[in-house]
Interface confidence: low
Amino acid sequence: AITEAREEAKPYPLFPGPFPGSLQTDHTPLLSLPHASGYQPALMFSPTQPGRPHTGNVAIPQVTSVESKPLPPLAFKHTVGHIILSEHKGVKFNCSISVPNIYQDTTISWWKDGKELLGAHHAITQFYPDDEVTAIIASFSITSVQRSDNGSYICKMKINNEEIVSDPIYIEVQGLPHFTKQPESMNVTRNTAFNLTCQAVGPPEPVNIFWVQNSSRVNEQPEKSPSVLTVPGLTEMAVFSCEAHNDKGLTVSKGVQINIKAIPSPPTEVSIRNSTAHSILISWVPGFDGYSPFRNCSIQVKEADPLSNGSVMIFNTSALPHLYQIKQLQALANYSIGVSCMNEIGWSAVSPWILASTTEGAPSVAPLNVTVFLNESSDNVDIRWMKPPTKQQDGELVGYRISHVWQSAGISKELLEEVGQNGSRARISVQVHNATCTVRIAAVTRGGVGPFSDPVKIFIPAHGWVDYAPSSTPAPGNADPVLII
């Protein structure tokens, strides 16, 4: 249905004096032109008293007729002032003016809330020429009004560089309440108060709000919009929504879930991403966060060896990125690893424990108590040592590397020997007489060569001179093949 706002033909003529020839209802317009713009509003209203010349913005023509009579002021005629209608209805309203024929090319433009309406609006201008004047009716129609069509509409016409402006026509579109603020999902602490907000607008006003919790109304009496619901606290998840009522009916907001924060679920899928002699890189998949962001995680590591004392090492890390490199571990050892994460409520249970092993490493200390002495009868240097403590071998010993450097006047030569793991003595041939021999020893595993012991020096005299005093040091070492004794 199109609601039409039109001017009454009685008791006033549509185009009152002094121009002869009022427009009859059976007149056919000489010309009907679509306006440069067009539009679709829809509203209902009662016409005010139309027909009287507009007293506001008028143009006084300076041109005179043949008889030199001054022309009367030009003004839009009064029309309906206020149109109220429901959303999706159609509406049509118009403004009219009588213009002396001496003015050519007059156009009427439509404006809404101070902005010209251009583009696809349904505006039509009709011209009804007579002997001295032309009646112009500008119609504006909206086939299905929306809330956005609310506003003040006016017509404008330019004559003689003067602008003529009609009285405003106020369009008020009424419909179901429209939410401007709906409640939002929240994660809350158990038994702790929180607020939900709901706001809706018309027209028509007022808009009243009812709150609904888990399908049951919370408030018996409605509250005027906006409404804030204070919930004293929840012990379990709940769904809230609000109903907005006005004279046109009811609109229901989206339902929002209010979750109760809880401790997280334990992490899952703890896995070993990389393993070295002294570190293990693990990753895990976080469990459900209990509706509260994770803050940090704790990695718990214990030796899997049943003979260990069972103490647990704790490593704390940020929750992200679900990776952690556990350091300072023993080589070639087995560990049980579990992960737990916390949010603001507390710690999760520990993940399922996984078994992980470190690899072999190079020994971390050198052989101990290195002793070197000359066996002149066989022209050999005997070397003795103690193997590093098992804990510090960082793997299975495969042997030792011996470095011996021979220095005499202007000559220096280094030789490397390797010996098997079973002995703790070695014999090397004298390379140069009247020289200093410097010996260092290192332990070797499949993981690599450990540090060399501190150097031990012995002087090798010229033939015939014997020195039975051994040289020794309690320091570590590293070597290459040699004869084992």
Epitope: V285, P286, G287, F288, Q325
Partner: antibody, heavy 118, light 108 residues
């Protein structure tokens, strides 16, 4: 092929909230996490947060109080919401998939340019 | 948080020239979780080098990456016009995840 397509407003009023949807295809949100990163002339690339395949979230501490990331696995949608925006939050906001191996953002959305202004 | 410092901020290179840019971390990072991204104007960042030295499919072999601990670098053996872009380093090792400020590589 793997794609992440973003939709959201270009202009946000100060103190209002920003909502962006990242719609993914070519992979499942039950298998991969999705990160959110923003890029501004003043601060460069900034990591904001992530939603993991399990639905769990991790946020940059600097944004934890006003950031929310959620998803709908069945619709392949990831939802990003940041509250109380100010002019300093003007930036291009990206969603990006977290690869399985390497741990890196291997595919990125086209970005949503957001201006915070009245 | 781990701060990544890239240098230089801007550099230019001629066609065929060897290019190296660096990224220094404020604390040690496992090399498996250090990456480089390439970004061209109007486009999203692309994963360009992952885990310090690996190239995703589609990245030309003239690119390489190296480094460990706190010092990493990206090298282009022979500059080509299509390599002009901004390159960002990134650590995925500790929260919050962080990026470098970028090195803008221009064609001379």
């Amino acid at each position: 092929q793997v794609q992440l397509k973003q939709s959201g407003p270009g202009l946000v009023q100060p103190s209002q909230s920003l909502s962006i949807t990242c719609t993914v295809s070519g992979f499942s949100l039950t298998d991969y996490g999705v990160h959110w990163v923003r890029q501004s002339p003043g601060k460069g690339l900034e990591w904001l947060g992530v939603i993991w395949s399990s639905g769990t979230t991790d946020y940059n501490e600097a944004f934890i109080s006003r950031l929310s990331i959620s998803k709908d696995n069945s619709k392949s949608h990831v939802f990003f919401k940041m509250n109380s925006l100010q002019a300093i939050d003007t930036a291009i906001y990206y969603c990006a998939r977290k690869g399985h191996d390497p741990y890196a953002m291997d595919y990125w959305g086209q970005g949503t340019s957001v201006t915070v202004s009245s | 948080q781990i701060v990544l410092t890239q240098s230089p901020a801007i550099m230019s290179a001629s066609l065929g020239e060897r290019v190296t840019m660096t990224c220094t971390a404020s604390s040690s990072i496992s090399s498996s979780y250090f990456h480089w991204y390439q970004q061209k104007p109007g486009s999203s960042p692309k994963l360009w080098i992952y885990s310090t030295s690996n190239l995703p499919s589609g990245v030309p072999a003239r690119f390489s990456g190296s480094g460990s601990g706190t010092s990493y670098s990206l090298t282009i053996s022979s500059m080509e016009a299509e390599d002009a872009a901004t390159y960002y380093c990134h650590q995925y090792y500790r929260s919050p995840l962080t990026f470098g400020a970028g090195t803008k590589l221009e064609l001379k």
